[in-house]
């Protein structure tokens, strides 16, 4: 398991709420991709290929989430003081192998600008 | 240790039904995408059908889509064939197979399909 | 649907010596960087067994005598010292797209 800080800018905020941006690299076929909160799984995506190379993307713990081709963006809406804290990404590579996972994240500093509906 | 183990086989009419179990164990069955393959005595491997972790995808052989049916049930850890229109031609060992992300790295051993009258 | 044919239908090799199998699919399996073609070794009375993937990479467990090479349409299966307990036929298979298909087997034997 490797651990890091991300090399990216893992927060982009827009409207009260945040994008969480977790990548991986272009080569990786199919992986299982969590969004950790401290150690809480907040949201998962995983994406598998059968024998006919179709794609099946799956999430347990559901968020609103986009998939790119190296890149997993989870959507944190209605932020609060409450969301500040350390977020990871915990990616679990499947395909190429041989079965690897890496962990990288950052802390999500909450200021009253980009919180919602705040009170004038 | 990966098991597979399938069941179900035997003699059957033209025309008739049948339906295959495969009992897996030693792994997270519903993380895999499960598969069947057929062989005919003294022939090679065909494909016959696939379906994704959860059961909600499933493709199949153009020999036999409209006919066979498969399925899943991730609580029992078990993978199903339903045969129906059953040929002649459908007389073969069909084999359980995990799709292992990118090959098939177990198999069972088999169940013996025979279709005649 | 992509066709896969192998060559030779069989082949008699001396312990020891080389087996070389030939695999060639109707369209090209490369796809970024990976080529998705499969070997299986079927030994009789048994089922199939993973030998290679990704054209070239050995499973666990199998023997470094097997390797696999190869790239677009044109794949080889090369078993570099032949052994007994390799007796068995060899399929070819892709995953490109559905359906997955394999070749039809080439047998090897003892001469």
């Known amino acids: 398991e490797i651990n890091g800080s991300a090399n990216y800018e893992m927060f982009i905020f827009h409207n009260g709420g945040v994008q969480i941006l977790c990548k991986y690299p272009d080569i990786v076929q199919q992986f299982k991709m969590q969004l950790l909160k401290g150690g809480q799984i907040l949201c998962d995506l995983t994406k598998t290929k059968g024998s006919g190379n179709t794609v099946s993307i799956k999430s347990l713990k559901f968020c609103h989430s986009q998939l790119s081709n190296n890149s997993v963006s989870f959507f944190l809406y209605n932020l609060d003081h409450s969301h500040a804290n350390y977020y990871f990404c915990n990616l679990s590579i499947f395909d190429p192998p041989p079965f690897k996972v890496t962990l990288t994240g950052g802390y999500l500093h909450i200021y009253e600008s980009q919180l919602c509906c705040q009170l004038k | 240790e990966v098991q597979l183990v399938e069941s179900g086989g035997g003699l059957v009419q033209p025309g008739g039904s049948l339906r295959l179990s495969c009992a897996a164990s030693?792994?997270?069955?519903?993380?895999?995408?499960m598969d069947w393959v057929r062989q005919a005595p003294g022939k090679g491997l065909v494909w016959v059908s696939n379906i994704d972790e959860s059961g909600s995808i499933a493709e199949y052989s153009p020999f036999v889509k409209g006919r066979f049916t498969i399925s899943r049930d991730n609580a029992k850890n078990t993978l199903y064939l339903q045969m129906n229109s059953l040929r002649a031609e459908d007389t073969a060992v069909y084999y359980c197979?995990?799709?292992?992300?990118?090959?098939?790295?177990?198999w069972g051993q088999g169940t013996l399909v025979t279709v005649s009258s | 649907d992509i066709v896969m044919t192998q060559s030779p239908d069989s082949l008699a090799v001396s312990l020891g010596e080389r087996a070389t199998i030939n695999c060639k699919s109707s369209q090209s399996l490369l796809s970024g960087s990976f080529n998705y073609l499969t070997w299986y070794q079927q030994k009789p009375g048994q089922p199939p067994k993973l030998l290679i993937f990704y054209a070239s990479t050995r499973h666990t467990g199998v023997p470094d005598r097997f390797s696999g090479s190869g790239s677009g349409t044109d794949f080889t299966l090369t078993i570099s010292s032949l052994q007994a307990e390799d007796v068995a036929v060899y399929y070819c298979h892709h995953h490109y797209n559905a359906p997955p298909t394999f070749g039809p087997g080439t047998k090897v034997d003892i001469k």
């Open positions: 030693g792994f997270t069955f519903s993380d895999y995408w």
């Open positions: 197979s995990r799709w292992g992300r990118f090959a098939f790295d177990s």
